[in-house]
């Protein structure tokens, strides 16, 4: 007699590793025999897909070589005419042992930092993943972290956080491991001990004292009123990651000695300075504070460059500031003798507004900035080819002088007239080529410290002092 | 974009204290002077108090010697701390952003000074 | 300190017409070639926005239609808006940055006819 098709085994859950067989059985009484078809996530299984064999008259689904991408539900269907078609459906679980999709890599970073080792990882179940640092398990904590997708996160690296780092990747299926890889930590230059300042007596020999450390160990230079060094004796030791340099002179006249610390980050340099005056008594005048005063400028130098009467700020740090502000100033004009003319009254406009910069008289004598805009202008439009050559003699100890060190602004660290104005002041004497800048990129406002700006008309950007905030 | 958020204002008795803070982003803020100025209700605005990137303070002569002006470059945050406060004091305080011109204004921190 | 005295107090403008703002200052804000006077707007429930700085510099973003004029050693600053409109509605400052503490004028409420 007909009967209408009965599964009589009902599809079960199939757990299935990667590239094993798994097999779906699809077991039916009926009469006459009847037609049966299988499908995946409501798909039809093709009877040709060579991916799987289908046999006992379609009661057998078998997956050759299961793929991560095959889970989902399977149903058999059968169908004789007699009576309705019935299903049975039953899910395939692509069990999976873990795997390091994206392993971490060997990270330098600088102190301070965040670093993110990354290690991204696949399996089923989801494997747990942790990390080892050097033989042991590494403990989370509020600056460590293993973020949801496996990889590390360190805020706030510290020298303590370098070492060798793996991952490991776990379920129950089993283990997978990273690579070993290192994390190093870099830091920036900075000066443990300054040299102190001395008022002498004519001819008293002063040993200058100056301690700095980093990773790697920075190289300590001296320099004498923007110039290296070129009497007395240096000697230094390396301890500890820490840089020991002493300079010994015999006084004959007041200078201003400063200790550079550098050490080098990839193709960046760290640099940190500290500067000591040696005054001789008699040579020694009063100062109106502890750290300036402001007057108008009487130097030669920079006659054409500052504003007619311009009021400057005199650095009391010095032991005859006009002096010694006049000698920087003249020092750096020498070695811009041999730069492009489009160069040099740029260049020589950043120096003097650098080092006398404008000054608000008062109690407190607040001297006013450069604005990053003008200082990038001279930088990267009127003296890019000469800035990098600077910058790389620097770098390979070939520049005669350092005085460049100390006189030439560090751009980035300068106020933007884009955030405040009237913050910083403007070079009136750059007598750019209007031409020259259709090629400078404008500012946006998002990235003020590395675009530069078209800069104002001439005529708006007149020489100006602020007075305000000089009264306590 | 500069953005200056002010927070820790609040009702207050007379002779209390209050710290306000003014979160700042968007720009390089230990380069940068930063002003408290305020403004009582339905009155003009009356400067308060800069500090400069030396961390050296003016303050107007209403609120010297009770409100102090201070900041935390790394945390990009400049702070007032209000003590002995006055009725007079109810006012919506900004935190600017500015040398000589007030160039960036947050929002604003209500401080009521009530009994 | 510097005292700054606005007028008129309050003003009602149509839109197109011009309006001019004054501030007067107790004492001379000039300082190498500059005046330290600044103007602001309040709009209604906002907080106070830089129009003009050194007297006469229009501060980024600020439509052309606002202008300041004040120089040389005059106590006398001006605020003009040539072609006054409805977003214009607010209370102008002008306040002066010649040495602290820094003051404001009383301010001038400009409304729509």
């Known amino acids: 007699l007909p009967k209408a098709p009965v599964i009589t085994t009902p599809l079960e859950t199939v757990d299935a590793l990667v590239e094993e067989v798994a097999t779906f059985m699809c077991a039916v009484e009926s009469y006459p025999q009847p037609e049966i078809s299988w499908t995946r996530n409501k798909i039809l299984i093709k009877l040709f897909d060579t991916r799987y064999s289908i046999r006992e008259n379609g009661q057998l689904l078998t997956i050759l070589s299961v793929e991560d991408s095959d889970d989902g539900i399977y149903c058999c269907t059968a169908n004789n005419g007699v009576g309705g078609a019935v299903e049975s459906c039953g899910a395939l679980q692509v069990k999976m042992k873990p795997k390091i999709t994206r392993p971490p890599i060997n990270v330098k970073i600088i102190e301070g930092l965040k670093a993110v080792l990354p290690c991204t990882t696949m399996g089923n179940p989801k494997p747990s993943v942790s990390w080892i640092k050097g033989d042991s398990p590494l403990r989370e904590n509020s600056r460590i972290a293993v973020l949801e997708s496996g990889s590390l996160r360190i805020h706030n690296v510290q020298k303590e956080d370098a070492g060798q780092y793996r991952c490991v990747a776990k379920n129950s299926l089993g283990t997978a491991y990273s690579k070993v890889v290192k994390l190093e930590v870099e830091v920036f230059a900075r000066i443990l001990r300054a040299p102190e300042s001395h008022n002498v007596t004519f001819g008293s020999f002063v040993t200058l004292h100056c301690t700095a450390t980093g990773i790697p160990v920075p190289t300590i230079t001296w320099i004498e009123n923007g110039n290296a060094v070129s009497s007395g004796s240096i000697q230094e030791s390396v301890k500890d990651r820490v840089i020991d340099s002493r300079l010994q002179l015999f006084i004959t006249k007041p200078g201003l000695y400063t200790c550079i610390a550098t050490n080098k980050h990839g193709e960046k340099f760290s640099t940190a300075k500290a500067a000591a005056t040696i005054s001789i008594a008699e040579w020694s005048k009063p100062q109106k504070d502890n750290k300036g005063y402001c007057a108008q400028y009487r130097g030669e130098v920079c006659n054409a460059v500052l504003a007619k009467d311009a009021l400057v700020f005199l650095n009391t740090s010095y032991a005859d500031p006009e002096e010694a502000q006049e000698l920087l100033v003249h020092t750096a004009w020498n070695e811009l003798k041999v730069v492009s003319p489009v160069c040099r009254p740029a260049a020589e406009a950043l120096l003097c507004n650098h080092i006398f910069q404008e000054c608000s008289p008062g109690v407190v004598p607040t001297p006013i900035p450069i604005c990053r805009e003008y200082c990038l202008a001279v930088k990267e439009l009127f003296c890019a080819k000469e800035w990098l050559v600077m910058e790389e003699k620097t770098h390979r100890g070939l520049y005669r002088s350092e005085m460049h060190l100390l006189s030439v602004p560090e751009c980035s660290k300068l106020p933007s007239m884009h955030w405040d104005p009237t913050a910083c002041a403007r070079l009136p004497h750059l007598d750019y080529n209007k031409e020259n800048l259709k090629t400078f990129p404008p500012m946006t406002s998002s990235k003020p410290s590395v675009d530069i700006p078209n800069l104002p008309s001439s005529s708006s950007s007149s020489f100006s002092v602020s007075p305000t905030y000089s009264m306590t | 974009e500069v953005q200056l958020v002010e927070s820790g204002g609040g009702l207050v008795q007379p002779g209390g204290s209050l710290s306000l803070s003014c979160v700042a982003s968007?720009?390089?803020?230990?380069?940068?002077?930063m002003n408290w100025v305020r403004q009582a209700p339905g009155k003009g605005l009356e400067w308060l108090s800069v500090i400069d990137t030396h961390s050296i303070a003016y303050y107007a002569d209403s609120v010297k010697g009770r409100f102090t002006i201070s900041r935390d470059n790394v945390k990009n945050t400049l702070y007032l701390q209000l003590n002995n406060l006055k009725p007079e004091d109810t006012a919506l305080y900004y935190c600017?952003?500015?040398?000589?011109?007030?160039?960036?204004w947050g929002q604003g921190t209500q401080v009521t000074v009530s009994s | 300190e510097i005292v700054l005295t606005q007028s008129p107090s309050s003003v009602t403008a149509s839109i197109g017409e011009k309006v001019t703002i004054n501030c007067e200052s107790s004492q001379s804000v000039l300082y190498n070639q500059k005046n330290y006077l600044n103007w602001y707007q309040q709009r209604p429930g906002q907080s106070p926005r830089l129009l003009i700085y050194w007297a006469s510099t229009r501060q980024s973003g600020v439509p052309d239609r606002f202008s300041g004029s004040g120089s040389g050693s005059t106590t006398d600053f001006t605020l003009t808006i040539s072609s006054f409109q409805p977003e214009d509605v607010a209370v102008y400052y002008c306040?002066?940055?010649?040495?602290?503490?820094?003051?404001f004028g009383p301010g001038t409420k400009v409304e729509l006819k």
């Open positions: 306040q002066q940055a010649y040495n602290a503490p820094l003051t």
């Open positions: 600017v952003l500015g040398r000589t011109a007030l160039v960036r």
């Open positions: 968007g720009f390089t803020f230990s380069l940068y002077y």
